[in-house]
Interface confidence: medium
């Protein structure tokens, strides 16, 4: 599923991401835009043999199990395929664990490079939330 900007903002708010660990909703929508272009089925392979999955591009080396990443920790205790569902519950729950891990949203490279320090509220402007 490819979400609309405001559709995703509403879904993320429903799942409790607004101000989760101090990160406003705009940060999460911005991260999703530049990680996956709002596509729940996005997959991207990394040079270390791991793969990033879903709307927030969650990595199989640490957070989920795709059955083929050497040394996978699966800290979210889920199959990576669950992160590709049109229902973003699994991605959100795992993202909450990631953002609580100490580095905050710096765990997402796209957020660090494209969203951090910018007017992230622009990503939810005009949305009826």
């Amino acid at each position: 599923k490819v979400f609309g900007r405001c559709e995703l903002a509403a879904a993320m708010k429903r799942h409790g991401l607004d101000n989760y660990r101090g990160y406003s909703l705009g940060n999460w929508v911005c991260a999703a835009k530049f990680e996956s272009n709002f596509n729940t089925q996005a997959t991207n392979r990394n040079t270390d043999g791991s793969t990033d999955y879903g709307i927030l591009q969650i990595n199989s080396r640490w957070w989920c199990n795709d059955g083929r990443t050497p040394g996978s920790r699966n800290l979210c205790n889920i199959p990576c395929s669950a992160l590709l569902s049109s229902d973003i519950t699994a991605s959100v729950n795992c993202a909450k664990k990631i953002v609580s891990d100490g580095n905050g949203m710096n765990a997402w490279v796209a957020w660090r490079n494209r969203c951090k320090g910018t007017d992230v509220q622009a990503w939810i402007r005009g949305c009826r939330l």
């Epitope: 040079t47 043999g49 083929r68 590709l84």
Partner: antibody, heavy 115, light 107 residues
């Protein structure tokens, strides 16, 4: 137990297309990548690409882009590979395998003859 | 693409001999190297995963070693059922690649 059952041997004319199937049983089909491998005598084993059935995400070896197309039907736990514009170079045994980095589970192979 | 070169192409041995098969990668692949045995008209069978981890049901005479670019499959005291083709495969990067194979034949 995990099993991958491939469709039977095919004899095709040059220029035609063929669709090979791989039915998976004994595990959660949507969770694991299905890989496709080509074997020709004297050419060893070649990785064609892969599909994640749960999402339809696919990756292809550059060499096989435009030649192979992967699909999956999660209702029947079956993965498919279509090969188009067949030539004699496509005559080979084609295997599906479950993608665990390594390949522990293999189909029995489908022999394709183009002549 | 990572190229895997296996040597020798053919190895002629007598049952009871011990042998070593080599697989060399064109660049470092850490320990992401797997070994398969294939007999005529059969699917490949996984012997060793991640360089040295033996699969259950595989006889203990098969062992693997190496790291980086140089890997070895050793068969301690070859038995008649061991004859066939042996392939290595890397899972360090895409596309996945296989070695050209070593044929183990009876002398």
């Amino acid at each position: 137990q995990v099993q991958l059952q491939e469709s039977g041997a095919e004899v095709m004319k040059p220029g035609a297309s063929v669709k090979i199937s791989c039915k998976a049983t004994g595990y959660t089909f949507t969770t694991y990548w299905i890989e496709w491998v080509k074997q020709r005598p004297g050419h060893g084993l070649e990785w064609i690409g892969e599909i994640l059935p749960g999402s339809g995400s696919t990756y292809y070896n550059e060499k096989f882009k435009g030649k192979a197309t992967f699909t999956a039907d999660t209702s029947s736990n079956t993965a498919y590979m279509q090969l188009s514009s067949l030539t004699s170079e496509d005559s080979a045994v084609y295997y599906c395998a479950r993608g665990d980095g390594y390949y522990y589970y293999w189909g029995q192979g489908t022999t394709l003859t183009v002549s | 693409d990572i190229e895997l070169t296996q040597s020798p192409a053919t190895l002629s041995v007598t049952p009871g001999d011990s042998v070593s098969l080599s697989c060399r990668a064109s660049q470092s692949i850490s320990n992401n190297l797997h070994w398969y045995q294939q007999k005529s008209h059969e699917s490949p069978r996984l012997l060793i995963k991640y360089t040295s981890q033996s699969m259950s049901g595989i006889p203990s005479r098969f062992s693997g070693s190496g790291s980086g670019t140089d890997f070895t499959l050793s068969i301690n005291s070859v038995e008649t059922e061991d004859f066939g083709m042996y392939f290595c495969q890397q899972s360090n990067s895409w596309p996945r690649t296989f070695g050209g194979g070593t044929k183990l034949e009876i002398k």
